[in-house]
Structures are given as structure tokens and as C-alpha cells.
């Protein structure tokens, strides 16, 4: 089962940027992962399969990302103080059925004077 | 000249650990770099040259480190809340002469509930 409890590994930091990892079960084959800041969608990534099992990736908001078989990581470069907010991931599962939508891990990311700090609530 | 002002690039974060970078001038050939938390030495790295200009590295506290021609980076894994303290680097220059000892960049690193946060004072 996918739950919405805070995952302390959601955030990691890399020289002025933040990587936000959104986990999903390895059994999921086709999905949409969205990263929210408060109510705003910052990033969206859709993974589907086409004929011959070819994977199709749709990244309409042109976010930097890394996709593995159990997570989508979005990279936010040089986040500013306006990004000291609550972040969470939202997962839509297309395959295997049934179709599901779940809000996943969430955490509070606070920026001090261009420094990266992370406090999970 | 080496000064002790806070360097906002001193800290960077990597999946539950913190990288603390201690800069030094590229002209320095032989040196000892120590990382302090308050008055406690956490890490120490000495780079010297021997016969045939072979580089010797001494790392008595077995810290994870990365050495470049202008910085020593120490990696602290899973820092706990007791490490919400003032960190600074201390540089001893052996070569070129004269022998010098300098306290370098310092910054305040605060940990919230095992998450890594960084606020430079």
C-alpha cells in the first residue's frame, strides 16, 4: 500500500540545488508523478508503454528529472526563498489496474539566504 | 589572502550526509586542513610531498574526504542533532614558506529531526 507519511529521504542537496525524490512501488509499470509546492504543480512526468513495450516519457513542464524503477527524482536548481514551502508528490497509477491516485511523501523545505535547509513536519 | 568570512558554498548536502568544503589557495603545495565543530577536531588531512615529489596523504581520523588543488572536502554521514553547531576549517601551510596557520570559512549547520539544514551566520 502506498501511504502519505513523510519520507525523510525525500530531499537531498547538491551544490545549490535540491533533488526531490518521489517513490513509487516497483510493481507500477505506467504512471504519472506530479510534484506540488503547496497547491502548485511544479513538475509532471508521465511514463507509459507503447507497442513493443517501448517506454514513452512525457515531461510537459520540462523539469530536470531522473526516473528509476521505483522513484522519480526532480531537480530544482537554485531554489529561492519563495520555495520555502510544503512539497509533496502525487502519483497516478495506470498499470497495473485498478487506476489509483495517491498523495505520497511530503515535507517542508525552507531556504535561509540561499542556503538549503530541510525540515520535515 | 585567506580570510575567515563565511563562505556560502561551505556546505552541500547528499542523501543524509553533509559535505563541508574547506578552500585553500592553489599555490599551497603542502598543508594540513582540520575541520572543527566548535572546539572539537572532527577531521584532519595532511598533504605533503616526499622524495621524487610523491604526494603523501595522512588522514588519521579516517574521515571520508575529497582533495583537489584548492579545497579539501570532508563528508560527515548521518550527522545527528548534536551536530547543530558552528563548523570551521583551520589551515596550516607548510609549503610554500612561511609556515602559517589560519582559521578559514565558518558556518552554522543545524539539524532538525535528522534532516540536514544549513544556515550560515
Amino acid at each position: 500500500e502506498i501511504n502519505g507519511s513523510a519520507d525523510h529521504r525525500m530531499f537531498s542537496f547538491h551544490n545549490g540545488g535540491v533533488q526531490i525524490s518521489c517513490k513509487y512501488p516497483e510493481t507500477v509499470q505506467q504512471l504519472k508523478m506530479r510534484l506540488f509546492r503547496e497547491r502548485e504543480v511544479l513538475c509532471e512526468l508521465t511514463k507509459t508503454k507503447g507497442s513493443g513495450n517501448a517506454v514513452s516519457i512525457k515531461n510537459p513542464m520540462l523539469c530536470l528529472y531522473h526516473l528509476s524503477n521505483n522513484s522519480v527524482s526532480f531537480f530544482l536548481n537554485n531554489p529561492d526563498s519563495s520555495q520555502g514551502s510544503y512539497y509533496f508528490c502525487s502519483l497516478s497509477i495506470f498499470d497495473p489496474p485498478p487506476f489509483q491516485e495517491r498523495n505520497l511523501s511530503g515535507g517542508y523545505l525552507h531556504i535561509y539566504e540561499s542556503q538549503l535547509c530541510c525540515q520535515l513536519k | 589572502e585567506i580570510n575567515g568570512s563565511a563562505d556560502h558554498r561551505m556546505f552541500s548536502f547528499h542523501n543524509g550526509g553533509v559535505q563541508i568544503s574547506c578552500k585553500y589557495p592553489e599555490t599551497v603545495q603542502q598543508l594540513k586542513m582540520r575541520l572543527f565543530r566548535e572546539r572539537e577536531v572532527l577531521c584532519e588531512l595532511t598533504k605533503t610531498k616526499g622524495s621524487g615529489n610523491a604526494v603523501s596523504i595522512k588522514n588519521p581520523m579516517l574521515c571520508l574526504y575529497h582533495l583537489s588543488n584548492n579545497s579539501v572536502s570532508f563528508f560527515l554521514n548521518n550527522p545527528d542533532s548534536s551536530q547543530g553547531s558552528y563548523y570551521f576549517c583551520s589551515l596550516s601551510i607548510f609549503d610554500p614558506p612561511p609556515f602559517q596557520e589560519r582559521n578559514l570559512s565558518g558556518g552554522y549547520l543545524h539539524i532538525y529531526e535528522s534532516q540536514l539544514c544549513c544556515q550560515l551566520k
Epitope: - | 605533503t48 622524495s51 609549503d95
Partner: antibody
Amino acid sequence: EVQLVESGGGVVRPGGSLRLSCVASGVTFDDYGMSWVRQAPGKGLEWVSGINWNGGDTDYSDSVKGRFTISRDNAKNSLYLQMNSLRAEDTALYYCARDFYGSGSYYHVPFDYWGQGILVTVSS
Amino acid sequence: EIVLTQSPGTLSLSPGERATLSCRASQSVSRSYLAWYQQKRGQAPRLLIYGASSRATGIPDRFSGDGSGTDFTLSISRLEPEDFAVYYCHQYDMSPFTFGPGTKVDIK
């Protein structure tokens, strides 16, 4: 207070062997590179050999290369000089000397602390 | 090896006078890896100057070093009675590390 105390000197015949020791106190011994420097009676100073903090780097003057071996035991705060195939010209007061910087190297460093010296006499 | 030549061999001066000692290297001593030591009879050498011009810990400021490349000098601005001794230059640039033959500063 830093102290370096040499021992093991004496009179030996040409071709013989001696092992000099230098024990350090009042210092974190493995922070320092060490050297042996000798002084023949009434003469000047001659660097003999050097060793870095962990013994991984050693060097010798041409006059003793292949005959003398420098080593150290950090657990015992001790520096050694094994002298084989001794010659009359090896007769001297032998000093152990510590690297000034605490760099762990004997290379590109001057010497600040010296022992009081130990006399080695090679004579038939 | 780098051969160091010191001059003069002996310097006879009175307390209060200035002493200037010379050390010449057979080839350039890079990065100023040159030191000066003082040795009194029956004692171990004492580091005075390193890096050609930097005073070692506890050395009075009447001692100063200068020079680069192949020519170096040690100056004692006003000789004190305890300064009468033998002075050696030492290059630690290139192995084998070498010392000069020494300059004896004695009382006139």
C-alpha cells in the same frame, strides 16, 4: 616539553653494525617527519636520512645509501637508524631531528627540535 | 647535490655590532627552501630562520634572513653576548639535503 633522546651509540670496528634509537616525548610523534643528521668531530653538519610520518617514504644521503636503514615505530614514539658496514668516516655525533611544521614529512622541511646527540666511533 | 658555500669562515666582531653572513648555493634553491641554524659548543643546532626569511618560534627580531635563488644572507642587527656561535645554512629543497660548512662568529 618536547624531548628527543638518542641512544645506541658506542665504539665499533670497521665493517661492524650499530642500531641507534631516538625516543620522543612531549609530542604527538606521528605528526612529524624525522631525520638523522650527523656531525663529525670538529666538522659541520651532514644530513644522513629522513623518514615520513608512517615510514612510507624514506631517503638517504649518497654516503650511507645501501648501508643505513631508517625506520620508526610510532607506537613506541621511536625512530631508528640501523647502520651496517660501518666505516671510519661514519664516526660522528648523530642527532635525530624533528620536522618543524608537524607536517609528517622530512621533505622540504627544516628541523626545529634536535636531540642531544649520540656518539658513534668507528675504529680498529 | 647542491653545495652550499659560506663566507666568511670566521667573523670577529664586538657586542652591539652588526653581523652579515653569506651563503651561496651551487644551483638555485627553489621556493626559498633555505634555513639558518645556530650552534653553540656542546649543544645541538637551533633553528633561527626558515624559508630564507621567516623567523622560527622564539627567535629575537635582531635575526633576519634574506635572499633567493643562489644567494642568501643572515643578518644580526646588534650582536648580543649569547650570539657568538657557529651559524650554518641548510638547503632542504633537493635531496640530499645539505648544510654549509659554517661561519664562526667570535668576539673581537
